[in-house]
């Protein structure tokens, strides 16, 4: 890769963590909704 070692930057890591957090919140919300509907 042309960026060498710099592909694993903290700014990229933070973005990945934000996406993970968002997905966990969305999936958790959906799960709670499903349980509630049962």
């Amino acid at each position: 890769h042309s960026d060498g070692i710099f592909t694993d930057s903290y700014s990229r890591y933070r973005k990945q963590m934000a996406v993970k957090k968002y997905l966990a919140a969305v999936l958790g919300k959906r799960y709670k909704q499903r349980v509630k509907n049962k």
């Epitope: 070692i5 710099f6 592909t7 903290y10 890591y13």
Partner: antibody, heavy 112, light 110 residues
Framework: SVEESGGRLVTPGTPLTLTCTVS????????MNWVRQAPGKGLEWIGI??????TYYAPWAKGRFTISKTSSTTVDLKMTSPTTEDTATYFC?????????WGPGTLVTVSS | AQVLTQTPSSVSAAVGGTVTINCQSS????????LSWYQQKPGQPPNFLIY???NLASGVPSRFKGSGSGTQFTLTISDLECDDAATYYC??????????FGGGTEVVVK
């Protein structure tokens, strides 16, 4: 998280391998560094293995250390022929060009 | 080989005061910005403070400020607290895929 293991007392010239075990992220997207710190001294960068398993070393460390990816969660540092000057705490740290996740370190003592 | 020179090696200031630490690189860091700062206390691993010269890492108080580009960088700690007593290191990442640390600066808070 990141954790180092394998540090112990060795005699000069006895090869030693340290292991860095990661959890919560994949080595397929991470660059992992080895950094050391002699007692009472500053931080010293040894080398890095990138997400494609490419390795780069500090000029002084070439030939003295070998970094390798040994599984999807472990990176090794091999000290080929340690001398008393290699006595230090050895840290594993994630990041390319910056070090944003550190392990607690493992102590290596080289003494006869 | 790339050399990072940190000055001063030790600095003392009173609680509420300000300290400035300089880091000079013998070569320009990658993209002119790949310079980071770390705080280390005895018996602990370094703590990531600032990345790409001026960006605060998550959870780091805004009293810590990084600046500079290319070969000259500065860490400024304002409104000093007792807890800021530590050794601070700069680190550079270079386009040759090599990294390095400065020699460290001990900050004493009176």
């Amino acid at each position: 998280s990141v954790e180092e293991s394998g540090g112990r007392l060795v005699t000069p010239g006895t090869p030693l391998t340290l292991t860095c075990t990661v959890s919560g992220f994949s080595l397929s997207s991470a660059a992992m560094n080895w950094v050391r710190q002699a007692p009472g001294k500053g931080l010293e960068w040894i080398g890095i293995i990138d997400n494609t398993a490419g390795t780069y070393y500090a000029p002084w460390a070439k030939g003295r250390f070998t970094i390798s990816k040994t599984s999807s969660t472990t990176v090794d540092l091999k000290m080929t022929s340690p001398t008393t000057e290699d006595t230090a705490t050895y840290f594993c740290a994630r990041g390319g060009g910056e070090f944003f996740i550190w392990g607690p370190g493992t102590l290596v003592t080289v003494s006869s | 080989a790339q050399v990072l020179t940190q000055t001063p090696s030790s600095v003392s200031a009173a609680v509420g005061g300000t300290v400035t630490i300089n880091c000079q690189s013998s070569q320009s860091v990658h993209d002119g910005s790949y310079l980071s700062w770390y705080q280390q206390k005895p018996g602990q691993p370094p703590n990531f403070l600032i990345y790409q010269a001026s960006n605060l890492a998550s959870g780091v108080p805004s009293r810590f400020k990084g600046s500079g580009s290319g070969t000259q960088f500065t860490l400024t700690i304002s409104d000093l607290e007792c807890d800021d007593a530590a050794t601070y290191y700069c680190a550079g990442g270079y386009s040759s895929n090599i990294c390095g640390f400065g020699g460290g600066t001990e900050v004493v808070v009176k």
